[in-house]
């Protein structure tokens, strides 16, 4: 039997490799049984997760799941890092796994690393 608690379906250790200057939507898949919870995004800074108050967010509704979306318009180099979504309802807080954005700054990178390089040597993206 499926749990009727709020579920946030971000996979453990998920990551996205993206280009600075491009638009990007970071999705938090949310499943709930009754009323929609209050969902927020935060960015990890060491052990604390700093709430992203003034960033553009939206909902995309589908029949059995909703997506709470954090918009990057455009992606900036300092968007690099790990993000987490949280759902709050009736005093319960549910936190997702973190998802990491690896941002390539096309201005400073003389040549783009290949996808294989990015997967095996993510430090390339911090040059």
């Amino acid at each position: 039997k499926e749990s009727c608690d709020v579920q946030l379906y971000i996979k453990r250790q998920s990551e996205h490799s993206i280009l600075a200057g491009d638009p990007f939507e970071l999705e938090c898949p949310v499943k709930y049984c009754a009323n929609r919870p209050h969902v927020t995004w935060c960015k990890l800074n060491g052990t604390t997760c700093v709430k992203l108050e003034d960033r553009q967010t939206s909902w995309k509704e589908e029949k059995n799941i909703s997506f709470f979306i954090l918009h990057f318009e455009p992606v900036l180099p300092n968007d690099n890092g790990s993000y987490r979504c949280s759902a709050n309802f009736q005093s319960n807080l549910i936190e997702s796994h973190s998802t990491t954005l690896y941002v390539t700054d096309v201005k400073s990178a003389s040549e783009r690393p290949s996808k294989d390089e990015m997967a095996s040597r993510p430090w390339l993206l911090y040059r």
Epitope: K31, Y32, C33, A34, N35, R36, P37, H38, V39, S58, W59, K60, E61, E62, K63, N64, I65, S66, N88, F89, Q90
Partner: antibody
Framework: EVQLVESGGGLVQPGGSLRLSCAAS????????MHWVRQATGKGLEWVSV???????YYPGSVKGRFTISRENAKNSLYLQMNSLRAGDTAVYYC???????????????WGQGTTVTVSS | EIVLTQSPATLSLSPGERATLSCRAS??????LAWYQQKPGQAPRLLIY???NRATGIPARFSGSGSGTDFTLTISSLEPEDFAVYYC??????????FGQGTRLEIK
């Protein structure tokens, strides 16, 4: 009887503020998405804001930073605080109830009669 | 933002005729679409929710269909009280929640 009654409309100068109220009866507003929708004379419907059961609030770009939606559960009332008003905010303002639970959508099924806001010098 | 385009802007028909109103979304809204009727000096009234479900108390002559980007409101046989303005509204990608510009249904 399920009912919504708006109040607080009136004439205000550009740059001024106004607070609209919506008193609900026959149901509990904190169990629903509660909206403000406006309509300028002879024009279509324009969504203004929503507050969800969890207290989350959302606005379109046209009013974000100027309007604030809130509710008082003890009074079963919904509010819209409108600041920095412009001539373009002149409209009839309706509050409406919407059911949206478990990823199903039920539409805005209960509406108030509306309250008129006129922004003019 | 999702733009809803309703057509025609005005529809002139006689009582007893069939009315077909269209609402087209700029991108898919799944079935998260509602239809409202509004008469002069009155608040809107919910007719159809979730694209095809009749709201409580709405006569069977009103029906909704469609999913994705193309939706239709059909009134099978017009009654005198059906002449009004009709709006579609989406709640699929939001904010903002958006309404169509309306279709005016008038007596021919």
């Amino acid at each position: 009887e399920v009912q919504l009654v708006e109040s607080g409309g009136g004439l205000v100068q550009p740059g001024g503020s106004l607070r609209l109220s919506c008193a609900a009866s026959g149901f509990t507003i904190s169990s629903y998405d509660m909206h403000w929708v406006r309509q300028a004379t002879g024009k279509g419907l324009e969504w203004v804001s929503v507050i969800g059961p969890a207290g989350d609030t959302y606005y379109p770009g046209s009013v974000k930073g100027r309007f604030t939606i809130s509710r008082e559960n003890a009074k079963n009332s919904l509010y819209l605080q409108m600041n920095s008003l412009r001539a373009g905010d002149t409209a009839v303002y309706y509050c409406a109830r919407e059911g949206m639970a478990a990823h199903n959508y039920y539409g805005m099924d209960v509406w108030g009669q509306g309250t008129t806001v006129t922004v003019s010098s | 933002e999702i733009v809803l385009t309703q057509s025609p802007a005005t529809l002139s028909l006689s009582p007893g005729e069939r009315a077909t109103l269209s609402c087209r979304a700029s991108q898919s809204v799944s079935s998260y679409l509602a239809w409202y009727q509004q008469k002069p000096g009155q608040a809107p009234r919910l007719l159809i929710y979730d694209a095809s479900n009749r709201a409580t108390g709405i006569p069977a002559r009103f029906s909704g269909s469609g999913s994705g980007t193309d939706f239709t409101l059909t009134i099978s046989s017009l009654e005198p009280e059906d002449f009004a303005v009709y709006y579609c509204q989406q709640r699929s990608n939001w904010p903002p929640i958006t309404f169509g510009q309306g279709t005016r249904l008038e007596i021919k």
